[in-house]
Every structure is written in structure tokens, then in C-alpha cells.
Amino acid sequence: QPSVSPGEPSPPSIHPGKSDLIVRVGDEIRLLCTDPGFVKWTFEILDETNENKQNEWITEKAEATNTGKYTCTNKHGLSNSIYVFVRDPAKLFLVDRSLYGKEDNDTLVRCPLTDPEVTNYSLKGCQGKPLPKDLRFIPDPKAGIMIKSVKRAYHRLCLHCSVDQEGKSVLSEKFILKVRPAFKAVPVVSVSKASYLLREGEEFTVTCTIKDVSSSVYSTWKRENSQTKLQEKYNSWHHGDFNYERQATLTISSARVNDSGVFMCYANNTFGSANVTTTLEVVDKGFINIFPMINTTVFVNDGENVDLIVEYEAFPKPEHQQWIYMNRTFTDKWEDYPKSENESNIRYVSELHLTRLKGTEGGTYTFLVSNSDVNAAIAFNVYVNTKPEILTYDRLVNGMLQCVAAGFPEPTIDWYFCPGTEQRCSASVLPVDVQTLNSSGPPFGKLVVQSSIDSSAFKHNGTVECKAYNDVGKTSAYFNFAFKGNNKEQIHPHTLFTP
């Protein structure tokens, strides 16, 4: 019993005066608390308590469940205790089988003994299975058996408290340990799509997948820069122990333009947080934006190839695409394909392949595309660069020599005179008249130039050269002159190809 200094309040005195008392089942428990300021007896077992305001605690026929700690308390709040074991060979353990352990922490298997004199108080696996090799425990007959530093691997471990009684092993009811994992990493979050494009009135639905070791992970959808509560639905699965998956689906049944913005799926646990975002763009109606990948004015040499390429954004999906030239639709020579295979792709490419273009195939090539909301078009002006072709070269009745040439770009015509039999015509002759004529062909066709000189200026035999040229090449025509007396004759005009 405790001893105190005189004058100070002292704790109550208990009879019998020992810390532990062993009684047999069916026997009487009689405990007397002596204190002038007696307040109450408290009985505690498996962390449950009962009170008694009588200073003598009497249990006429003790049962195993009367095993526990009896505490007498006085008005000063001072107390004294005695632990009573009610020995019952048929009930060696009192149990509370709720058994939860937090990873890396200790947990108590609540199986206090009713008989402190049994031996080998320990834990055993169910069905004769051994306990994990690293499982450490400390037995306490009055409280149970403390498992030290619970491991995740112990989850759903089935075990019994065990003692040896008269040489035989006696097992308690089974305990199943439920381990709550410690969070040792942030949750893993992912989103079904990184961006969404919708028309007003369409449904917006996006799913966030959250993965963690337990369902205790917190998650929510948030609108950036907004406190508005969002409507979410959940599905969740346990893919085995400590592999939990939740799908949080955010839905806006009829999206509006002002719903556009960034939505964040946020998840956190005691270790930390993670988030992922998706962007919603809501448009009042669909659109098509076309971007030419080459200049819309195209110059190409005769006989060469050219690809007319556009990229375009179309939302909703494009329904009709076509390339048109001179009111005729191309049925082949073109291809149209999405820029990427991404589910949210709205960008497409269309290519028209023009091969071995002729001078007559210049003109406006138009790409048209439409979806359910809008139409759009883009035109390419294609100019075919052609070497000049001399269409006519004549001596007119008025004595003029006339040369007409066609080509693109517009040819320049120069005149030269070669006296006698010289091959090189170097002396240039100034034209009397130069005109650009309207071509009877399609626009973007060859440009026709007419140039004239006065033949009366030539006094000697020789050759007159009409030379038409542009960036692509040159062509010449020749007039041969011979004088018979005073008469000048054009012997045969002819052309020479000059590469």
C-alpha cells in the first residue's frame, strides 16, 4: 500500500492489500476500499468500464469476465488499484477481436488472460501456419499481445492468442489483422483527355482516375479560379490489397460558353498531393479555320509537279472536302487525313498533287470543306511558267515585220539584224510598236506579246532575228532578206529553238 507524508491527501487503501489477486470461477470477489473521502470503484477490462458507488465491491459468483482492473478513487482524485484474475479453465482469454494496425505502428491484440499462471503466452498463426518471420510481439497478460511495427504484409493475417495449459496448447478465437497502409507516395492521377472542345448545349464528361494504397485517399474535381461545387460521380475498385482505384467523373450536362476553362482533378493523402488538368473550350457554334501550308500564289514551271497543301481546323468533324478547278471537281489526285490520331484532334491536312503541269493548266484551284455548322474555302492561284512560243512572224503589207510570242511570265521580244551570212545577230533593232494582247485562253494562261519593226530600215542582205524570252527560256524566229535590184524579199522565215 502507498505511504504518504502526514497532512497530504493520501490515496485510498484496498483490502486485500496486493496488486494482483487470483480467484477461481464461481468464488466470491470481495474488495474493500478504505478512505474517508471514498467516491467510487471502477472496474475495467478490455477498455470497458463499470462503476460502483459502494465502498465494498462484492461479486458473489465470479466469472471469467470479472477479470480486470478494480480501481478505487477518492474525492481528491487519488486512486489505488488491484488486478483480479478469475481463473476459468474453460475461458482462458477475454477477447475483443477488432484488430486494426497502422503500418509501421504497434497494435494490440486484445486477449488478456484470466489465469496469469499459464505459460508460453504468445501468438500463433491460424490453421497451423507459421507467423511471418519478422513479426515481433510483446505479451502482457493484463492487456493482450502487442505486435510491434506492423507491416503491410501482415494485412488479413489470421492469428490466435495461445497459451500452454497443463502441457497443452490452448488457442483463443481467431483474430484477423486489418492493416491500414501508411501513405509513402503521393496519389497517381490521370485524366481521360487533356482537352475538350464542345458546342453549346453538348454534354461535357471527363473522368479522373486516382490510384493509391487505400480508399482513404481524398480526391475532388475543382474549377480553376472558382469555388463552385462540381457534380461528380464515383466508381471504385480494390485490385487486391493496397491497390485502390477510383474513377471520379465530372459531368456538365449542357455546357455553356462560360463553362470554358481549366478543370483540375486534385488528390491528396497524408504524404502529399497530386493533380492533373483538362481544358474545356465551349464554342457557340462550330468552326473551320484553313491554313495554307504554301503561298496561295504559286509559280510552277511547265512540266513540273506542285503540291497544294492546306491544314485546317474543323469542329465538329469535317463532312465534305473537295478540290475544284475550272468548275470541275477532282475525283483523284488528292488526299485528306487527320493531322494526328489523337481522339481530340481537330486539325486535318488536305493535299492536291498536280503533276507535269501544262501551260494551259494554270488558274485558280479551290479547296472547299464543310461540317454541320459552316463552310470554308481557300483558293490557290497557280501560274505555270512557260518558255515563250512564237505564234506568228510575218512581213506585213505595210512593210512591217511582226512577231507575236506567248509565254509566262510575259515574254520580252528583242530584234536583231545580222548582215550577210553572219551567224551572230548582235546589232539590236528598236521595235516600232510593242503590245500586250489579251489571251483568248483562261486567266493565268500565257501572256501574248506583239512586237513590230520597220523592214525598210534594212539596206543589205541579211537575217532579222525576233527573239522572245522570259525567265523560263527563249525562242527565236528569223527573216532572211535578199535584194534583187531595188526589191527586198523575205526569203523564208524560220524559227530556231534556243534552250
Epitope: E44, D47, E48, T49, N50, V95, D96, R97, S98, Y100, K102, N105, T107, C126, Q127, R156, C158, K174, I176, R180, S214, S215, S216, H238
Partner: antibody
């Protein structure tokens, strides 16, 4: 003997919060898990979550996601359940229940929370 | 989550009748051969009261006319001879894994 005594009925407006208390006696408060269960009028029982003994870890039914917080005050042996952003769907009787020997052996008397504009 | 489906949803019976209520789980609630399935009785305006724990164990103080059976996914609560005080709503509940779930309830009414 074990007793769980809950706070009285509450009437709240939509968007408000409510904090229900559950005072425990007759056992060592810190040794047992405390669960919260609710029951909407004419409906079944719905588990909201648990605050575990010891470190006071919690585990919530994801249905209540960031809206629910369970706490304890060990000095008064009282458990609390706070529910935020209330809507009319949260009108229900809220119960605390002590887990003993793997089952809900003791229940509070219930607290009616009415959410009404 | 584990979904519990009770049948029937409601039942009319007379005093003295034998009544059986079933509860089916969407997946097994057993661990090491032990079923984490419990049965509760609830009367109007009152908190639920535990009747049967771990599928077949009678809670202390509950009359022996109540019994439970089953394992895995299929469970039964039986009242061998209905008494007037037994007219109430009965719920099954699993605590094998979180979130813990209840059946939707079976309302037992006087015929």
C-alpha cells in the same frame, strides 16, 4: 455500461455546415474505433466513415468526399462529425456507432439534421 | 464497393410464423473462413440493434429465436417464431472491406 449520447436536432440552410457530437462513457474512449452512419427519412443505413482508435486516423466513404471531417476530443471522450456544403439530400438521422469485437455493438440515439431553405 | 442486396424488401407475416430474410453480397465477405457479415434490427425512431454477428453468432441478450447462417456471398437471417416485438426493419451489413455497406433493408410487417 457503455453509452453514446449525441447532440440534439439541428436545422440548417443549404450550403451551411453541421457538427454533430457523440459523447462516450463506460469505456476507454481512445481504445475503440468510432463509426458514423446516417439514415435519410424512409431510407436505409449508409456508412459515412470511421475514426480509428490510437492516432485518430480517419477513413471516409468517398461519397462524402471533401465534405466530411471526423474528429475526437479525448479530454471529453467526445467524437465529432462535421458535414459541410449541406443540401436537402443531407437531411437524415446521423448515428455514431462504437466498433467492438468487429461489429457495431453500441449506437448513439441519433441526431436529426434537417436541411431546408 | 461490396453491394448487399436483401430480399424481400418487405414481408407480411403473422405472430408465430417462421420468417427468412436473405442477403446476397456482390463479392465474398469471408476472410479465413470467417464471414464479416452482421444483422441489425431497427424499430421506428430508434437506433439499430445488433442481432447476429459474423453470420451466425447470436449477440448477447438477443432471443434464441433469431439465427443466422451462410458464408461467402449468401446469408440468411431466420426468426423461428415471430413475436409481436419482432416487427421492424432488418439490415445486413458487411465490414470485410471499406466502405462498409448495408443492405437496403427488409421491412417486416404484421399481416
Amino acid at each position: 455500461q457503455v453509452q453514446l449520447v449525441q447532440s440534439g436536432a439541428e436545422v440548417k440552410k443549404p450550403g451551411a455546415s453541421v457538427k454533430v457530437s457523440c459523447k462516450a462513457s463506460g469505456y476507454t474512449f481512445t481504445s475503440y474505433n468510432m463509426h458514423w452512419v446516417r439514415q435519410a427519412p424512409g431510407q436505409g443505413l449508409e456508412w459515412m466513415g470511421v475514426i480509428y482508435s490510437g492516432q485518430g486516423d480517419t477513413s471516409y466513404n468517398q461519397k462524402f468526399k471533401g465534405r466530411v471531417t471526423m474528429t475526437t476530443d479525448t479530454s471529453t471522450s467526445t467524437a465529432y462529425m462535421e458535414l459541410r456544403s449541406l443540401t436537402s439530400d443531407d437531411t437524415a438521422v446521423y448515428y455514431c456507432a462504437r466498433e467492438r469485437d468487429t461489429r457495431f455493438g453500441n449506437w448513439g440515439q441519433g441526431t436529426l439534421v434537417t436541411v431546408s431553405a | 464497393e461490396i453491394v448487399l442486396t436483401q430480399s424481400p424488401s418487405s414481408l407480411s407475416a403473422s405472430v408465430g410464423d417462421r420468417v427468412t430474410i436473405t442477403c446476397r453480397a456482390s463479392e465474398s465477405v469471408d476472410i479465413y473462413g470467417e464471414s464479416f457479415m452482421h444483422w441489425y434490427q431497427q424499430k421506428p425512431g430508434k437506433a439499430p440493434k445488433l442481432l447476429i454477428y459474423h453470420a451466425s453468432n447470436l449477440e448477447s441478450g438477443v432471443p434464441s429465436r433469431f439465427s443466422g447462417s451462410g458464408s461467402g456471398t449468401d446469408f440468411t437471417l431466420t426468426i423461428s417464431s415471430l413475436q409481436p416485438e419482432d416487427f421492424a426493419t432488418y439490415y445486413c451489413q458487411q465490414n470485410r472491406e471499406e466502405p462498409y455497406t448495408f443492405g437496403q433493408g427488409t421491412k417486416l410487417e404484421i399481416k
